[in-house]
């Protein structure tokens, strides 16, 4: 039969209620009375789903009695006031404690009335990202690493590049019963072309506003790669002096530049200033090959130039002269 | 301490209408909702209905709809329950009883239909 | 409605000894569930709420257990003063049912 009034009472509760392990949660339960409905409320109960009995109770009489005294609290129901506020905090959140709860008012004229809370369980990973230094292997190895640990539910990490690449992600259980630790590998060809980027690692957990973005700055180690620059084919008799450098990009930094010519060492006219070369005015012609040996960790490499130094158009040209 | 004092035993024709009073004291009697139970000779409990004293808002057994009728008088803290139409068959023990669940009882009032 | 079925209308029991009294709903009621005692002459006494709770001054050999549709009221160590018929009742919908009642009888 229908009650007295417009409408019926409502119990009101969010569907789903996040919690972080170790910390307290409140699974708000509120009855909504319309405004021309009577009710009064004899009970607050809730109970969990599978379990036998209540976990905790409020009776206007009786007043609060729970499962475990030590881990719950009614927030806002008190003897001798309106039960309307059924709202429950839980103390020392577990990982058993995710679950369905359902919470209960009984109220007299219209009987029980009810709805069911999801309580999830969470815990927000600490998240770090390193680089793994590599040298050029020819084959496809981990290049970063990204760990989210100590999570619930895991992470899911993923990798942001315009180098490529291809992620290789594991899981396994974190310090803490329930959580997972995820650890992924950014892996890809080792170049000299990728030392010195970035890759970005991207971590998104349900405790998080927004993903973390993790930067890694990839480091491969190689040997030197070698040019002379500062040759324009164009040097004269009679021209200014002249520098060549020897350029050289390697991981780890070069050690050591070595000039020298096909031929064995420097003429008198090439005088080294470790990278750079410097060529002095010549009075007749050259035709040489200088070659700059570049040393680093991994080994040496080199480069050669051939230099000529003609007879030919007057001084306005840039180049070798005396002064 | 919460008491409810049940009006006396009763002996009523058949057909007529007989009025029983639960007076109730050691509380605020728009707390508590007030219900009334029947219990025939030896047998079990039968909800008849429930008053809540605040609004006066009732909630009756179906099978006692038109038999029962449920009042309070807030000034004197009491609740009354009118019982209509009486047959040998409404002959019982009448309780009122405060709060859901039923935590606390009158003594029960004797009801006789006889001619 | 709700029909709550006390299957044992009578239990025997010796002093000292455990018993449990059974109760069926015939739908789902949570835990809205009380447990009364009615001595010979007396008005019943309310024992147990929520299922398994006990009201203040209710001895602790009293002890209810139960949610959906199955309840138990166990009484252990019994004492002689605990003979009594015991009724469980729901209160989670209207109208309010009770059970048909156990008489506990001590040997």
């Known amino acids: 039969w229908p009650p007295p009034g417009t409408g019926d009472v409502v119990v009101q509760a969010p569907t789903q209620v996040p919690g972080f392990l170790g910390d307290s949660v409140t699974l708000p339960c509120y009855l909504q009375v319309p405004n021309m409905e009577v009710t009064h409320v004899s009970q607050l109960t809730w109970a969990r789903h599978g379990e036998s009995g209540s976990m905790a109770v409020f009776h206007q009489t009786q007043g609060p009695s729970y499962s475990e005294s030590k881990r719950l609290e009614f927030v806002a129901a008190r003897l001798g006031a309106e039960l309307r506020n059924a709202s429950l905090r839980m103390f020392g959140l577990r990982v058993e404690d995710e679950g369905n709860y359902t919470c209960l008012f009984v109220t007299f004229p219209q009987g029980s009335r009810s709805v069911d809370i999801w309580l999830r369980v969470l815990a927000k990973p600490q998240n770090t990202a390193e680089v793994q230094k590599v040298q050029l292997t020819g084959e496809p190895v981990p290049m970063a690493r990204c760990v989210s640990t100590g999570g619930r539910p895991p992470a899911q990490i993923t990798w942001h590049s315009d180098l490529g690449g291809m992620p290789n992600t594991s899981q396994v259980p974190g310090f803490l019963s329930g959580t997972v630790t995820v650890t992924s590998l950014w892996i890809l060809v080792p170049s000299s072309q990728v030392d010195g980027k970035n890759v970005t690692c991207k971590v998104e957990h349900e405790s998080f506003e927004k993903p973390q973005l993790l930067t890694v700055n990839l480091t491969v180690y190689y040997p030197p790669e070698v040019s002379i620059s500062g040759y324009d084919n164009n040097w004269y008799l009679g021209q200014n002096e002249a520098t060549l450098t020897c350029d050289a990009r390697s991981n780890p930094e070069p050690t050591g530049y070595n000039w020298s010519t096909t031929m064995g060492p420097l003429p008198p006219f090439a005088v080294a200033q470790g990278a750079q070369l410097l060529i002095r005015p010549v009075d007749k012609p050259i035709n040489t090959t200088l070659i700059c040996n570049v040393t680093n960790a991994l080994g040496a490499r080199q480069a050669e130039l051939t230099v000529q130094v003609k007879e030919g158009p007057p001084s306005e040209h840039s180049g070798i002269s005396r002064n | 301490e919460v008491k409810l004092q049940e009006s006396g035993p009763e002996l009523v024709k058949p057909g007529a209408s007989v009025k029983i009073s639960c007076k109730t004291s050691?509380?605020?009697?728009?707390?508590?909702?007030m219900h009334w139970v029947r219990q025939s000779h030896g047998e079990s409990l039968e909800w008849i209905g429930g008053?809540?004293?605040?609004?006066?808002?009732?909630n009756y057994n179906q099978n006692f709809k038109g038999k029962a009728t449920l009042t309070v008088d807030k000034s004197s803290s009491t609740a009354y329950m009118e019982l209509r139409s009486l047959t040998s068959e409404d002959s019982a023990v009448y309780y009122c009883?405060?709060?859901?669940?039923?935590?606390?009882w009158g003594q029960g009032t004797s009801v006789t239909v006889s001619s | 409605d709700i029909v709550m079925t006390q299957s044992q209308k009578f239990m025997s029991t010796s002093v000292g000894d455990r018993v449990s009294v059974t109760c069926k709903a015939s739908?789902?009621?949570?835990?809205?569930v009380a447990w009364y005692q009615q001595k010979p002459g007396q008005s019943p006494k309310a024992l147990i709420y929520?299922?398994?709770y006990r009201y203040r001054g209710v001895p602790d050999r009293f002890t209810g257990s139960g949610s959906g549709t199955d309840f138990t009221l166990t009484i252990s160590n019994v004492q002689s003063e605990d003979l009594a018929d015991y009724f469980c009742?729901?209160?989670?919908?209207?109208?309010?049912?009770f059970g048909s009642g156990t008489k506990l009888e001590i040997k």
């Open positions: 050691g509380y605020t009697f728009t707390e508590y909702t």
């Open positions: 929520s299922a398994s």
């Open positions: 739908q789902n009621v949570y835990t809205n």
């Open positions: 009742q729901q209160y989670n919908s209207y109208p309010l049912a």
């Open positions: 008053i809540d004293p605040n609004n006066g808002g009732t």
């Open positions: 009883a405060g709060v859901i669940p039923l935590e606390y």
